[in-house]
């Protein structure tokens, strides 16, 4: 099978998911690719409990999550429905601000220093969090 029953080395298990927290920065697309090569995805926050868990691990540092509106509407990278799902934006965010002078608006979401979300320029080199789900019915041994 291709499922996971336990988390890879250096990943943190929480509520049937595995999380990896970067300590350096990349642009959103590069962080996204990094997670995909780990057979994972940028973190998708589905509850206040998961928000607090991630916030505890990243501290007060701008950190990318798997939420963007590069193609129009806001979308989670794993297909989780944005409209009906958990949200934790800062007041008056997202605002697709154009005043940064870098060209275009702001299409990628990140955790801010207080954990609440902001949209920002996707090229900014922020830290990131990868997430992958654990599956119960695995025939594969744990990753070593």
């Amino acid at each position: 099978g291709s499922e996971r029953t336990c988390c890879p080395v250096n990943w943190v298990e929480h509520e049937r998911s595995c999380y990896w927290f970067s300590r350096s920065g990349k642009a959103w697309a590069d962080a996204d690719n990094y997670c995909r090569l780990e057979d994972a995805h940028l973190v998708v926050v589905t509850s206040w409990e998961e928000q607090k868990f991630v916030q505890h691990h990243i501290g007060p540092v701008n950190t990318w999550m798997g939420l963007h509106d590069q193609n129009g509407p806001w979308k989670w990278v794993d297909g989780t429905d944005y409209e009906t799902g958990f949200k934790n934006w800062r007041p008056e965010q997202p605002d697709d601000w154009y005043g940064h002078g870098l060209g275009g608006g702001e299409d990628c979401a990140h955790f801010t220093d207080d954990g609440r979300w902001n949209d920002d320029v996707c090229q900014r080199p922020y830290r990131w969090v990868c997430e992958t789900e654990l599956d119960k019915a695995s025939q594969e041994p744990p990753l070593l």
Partner: antibody, heavy 121, light 109 residues
């Protein structure tokens, strides 16, 4: 001992196909993304393709996109590169390489010895 | 695309010399820079990762420095086995680029 061993290279005509293999040993193969990197005679290194540890994600250099397919069989600890519509400019030594990670830094930390692919009529 | 440019493209030196090779990136890649050594007919070998971290088993005469767009590989006291071609590689946006520099050939003077 950690080892990668490529095979499947040879002489092929333009427009032809070839399948390269890379047998891995000495590490948990399914835990690591794997790449193909090539080197034309007398030239530098060119990354070709990469596949995630469980095969869910693949990426290709623009120069081979639509012609080459990377795959893996974790039960056999083997990486593959299916090369179709081969061109003279694909002539190179093809290396398989393991994607190692320290922190968030990715590097090719283990390389095979390479297999030569010659595209000529 | 990020372009990686090495200088010089070739270099003659003697055993015991101190040698420095430079790699420049066309945009900021922070410390996402690796160095490889390749001897004729052999596969490349990882020397330095994250700009300055020495790969396990690599002699301490090799060192790397730099960040942003300019990086250097230094061999403090050149040994006979160090004559080879050296490549830098950015790992900021890998994939889909994984760009290597064009290489620096280190030859015996």
């Amino acid at each position: 001992e950690v080892q990668l061993l490529e095979s499947g290279g040879g002489l092929v005509q333009p427009g032809g196909s070839l399948r390269l293999s890379c047998a891995a040993s000495g590490f948990t193969f399914s835990s690591y993304a794997m790449s193909w990197v090539r080197q034309a005679p007398g030239k530098g290194l060119e990354w070709v393709s990469v596949i995630s540890g469980r095969g869910g994600s693949t990426y290709y250099a623009d120069s081979v996109k639509g012609r080459f397919t990377i795959s893996r069989d974790n039960s056999k600890n083997t990486l593959y590169l299916q090369m179709n519509s081969l061109r003279a400019e694909d002539t190179a030594v093809y290396y398989c390489a393991k994607r190692g990670i320290v922190g968030a830094t990715e590097a090719f930390d283990i390389w095979g010895q390479g297999t030569m692919v010659t595209v000529s009529s | 695309d990020i372009q990686m440019t090495q200088s010089p493209s070739s270099l003659s030196a003697s055993v015991g010399d101190r040698v420095t090779i430079t790699c420049r990136a066309s945009q900021n890649i922070y410390s996402y820079l690796n160095w490889y050594q390749q001897k004729p007919g052999k596969a490349p070998k990882l020397l330095i990762y994250a700009a300055s971290s020495l790969q396990s088993g690599v002699p301490s005469r090799f060192s790397g420095s730099g960040s942003g767009t300019e990086f250097t590989l230094t061999i403090s006291i050149l040994q006979p086995e160090d004559f080879a071609t050296y490549y830098c590689q950015q790992s900021y946006n890998t994939p889909p680029e994984c760009n290597f520099g064009q290489g620096t050939k280190l030859e015996i003077k």
